[in-house]
């Protein structure tokens, strides 16, 4: 779970070690601020619920790369 | 704050090798990726590669594949790259810079290399 | 690798002015790009990254816009302080690739 460190700046400091199903996820943003100890990858699921992840990870990168594609995909 | 401080500039003759430090300060080198780029007098940005200091897992461009090397100490929070077979062509600034997804929120101060017999 | 051109490659303006820097992609680069400025001597400095994501500290006036293959750059009101060379960068496949720079001069 994100932790906001203050209004600004939300921060990771332990990463999920489940894959998530792509299916699950709706958006994500990237952490990168120096105030945070790592640089992050934040997932929004369908339901709301916001994972941090490794974006070091393949599977992470995966999944970003998929919800750009899909983000830019029109819908029909 | 995140600080990257590199080493002094060099000179050298063709065909031989520098190696460029950069030691960071204000993070931990693990928690990301350490890249380096490039830059010839008067023109643009080049990216070279980056290491992933964990694990030292390495990634170029072609174009330098097999001239680089691209290493980390995390016990001393510091990149390096060395460039061999080194040409007229190779004189630049070379930076080191940080980021996780490809683009580069912190920069060192710049390393000029310059290659002449 | 993913080719990036960036244009003009230099530009005269006035203080106040609308700036604007287009770069192009050869193939769909999904948002993934960053601008950057840079002056004479200096290290380049992040300004965007992805879809619209300024730079902590970075001046509003400084946007970016853009999807596909086709982005920009727009300063809204030219200040002293902005003329510099800007870059564009592709982060969506390796090796990452950069735009041929934007010299901004003064009119």
């Known amino acids: 779970q994100p932790d906001a460190i203050n209004a600004a700046v939300t921060c990771c400091y332990n990463f999920t070690n489940r894959k998530i199903s792509v299916q699950r996820l709706a958006s994500y943003r990237r952490i990168t601020s120096s105030k945070c100890p790592k640089e992050a990858v934040i997932f929004k699921t369908i339901v709301a619920k916001e994972i941090c992840a490794d974006p070091k990870q393949k599977w992470v990168q995966d999944s970003m790369d998929h919800l750009d594609k899909q983000t830019q995909t029109p819908k029909t | 704050q995140v600080q990257l401080v590199q080493s002094g500039a060099e000179v050298k003759k063709p065909g031989s090798s520098v190696k460029v430090s950069c030691k960071a300060s204000?993070?931990?080198?693990?928690?990301?990726?350490m890249h380096w780029v490039r830059q010839a007098p008067g023109q643009g940005l080049e990216w070279m590669g980056r290491?992933?200091?964990?694990?030292?897992?390495?990634k170029f461009d072609p174009k330098f594949q097999g001239r680089v090397t691209i290493t980390a100490d995390t016990s001393t929070s510091t990149a390096y790259m060395e460039l061999s077979s080194l040409r007229s062509e190779d004189t630049a600034v070379y930076y080191c810079?940080?980021?996780?997804?490809?683009?580069?929120?912190?920069w060192g101060q710049g390393t000029t290399v310059t290659v002449s017999s | 690798d993913i080719q990036m051109t960036q244009s003009p490659s230099s530009l005269s303006a006035s203080v106040g002015d609308r700036v604007t820097i287009t770069c192009k992609a050869f193939?769909?680069?999904?948002?993934?790009r960053a601008w950057y400025q840079q002056k004479p001597g200096k290290a380049p400095k992040l300004l965007i990254h992805?879809?619209?994501s300024l730079e902590h500290g970075v001046p509003s006036r400084f946007s970016g816009s853009g999807s596909g293959t086709d982005y920009t750059l727009t300063i809204s009101s030219l200040q002293p302080e902005d003329f510099a060379t800007y870059y564009c960068?592709?982060?969506?496949?390796?090796?990452?690739?950069f735009g041929g720079g934007t010299k901004v001069e003064i009119k």
């Open positions: 810079a940080r980021g996780v997804f490809g683009f580069f929120e912190h």
């Open positions: 204000g993070l931990t080198i693990s928690h990301t990726y």
């Open positions: 290491i992933d200091p964990d694990n030292h897992n390495t």
């Open positions: 193939e769909d680069i999904y948002n993934r």
């Open positions: 992805g879809a619209t």
């Open positions: 960068q592709q982060f969506w496949s390796a090796p990452y690739t």
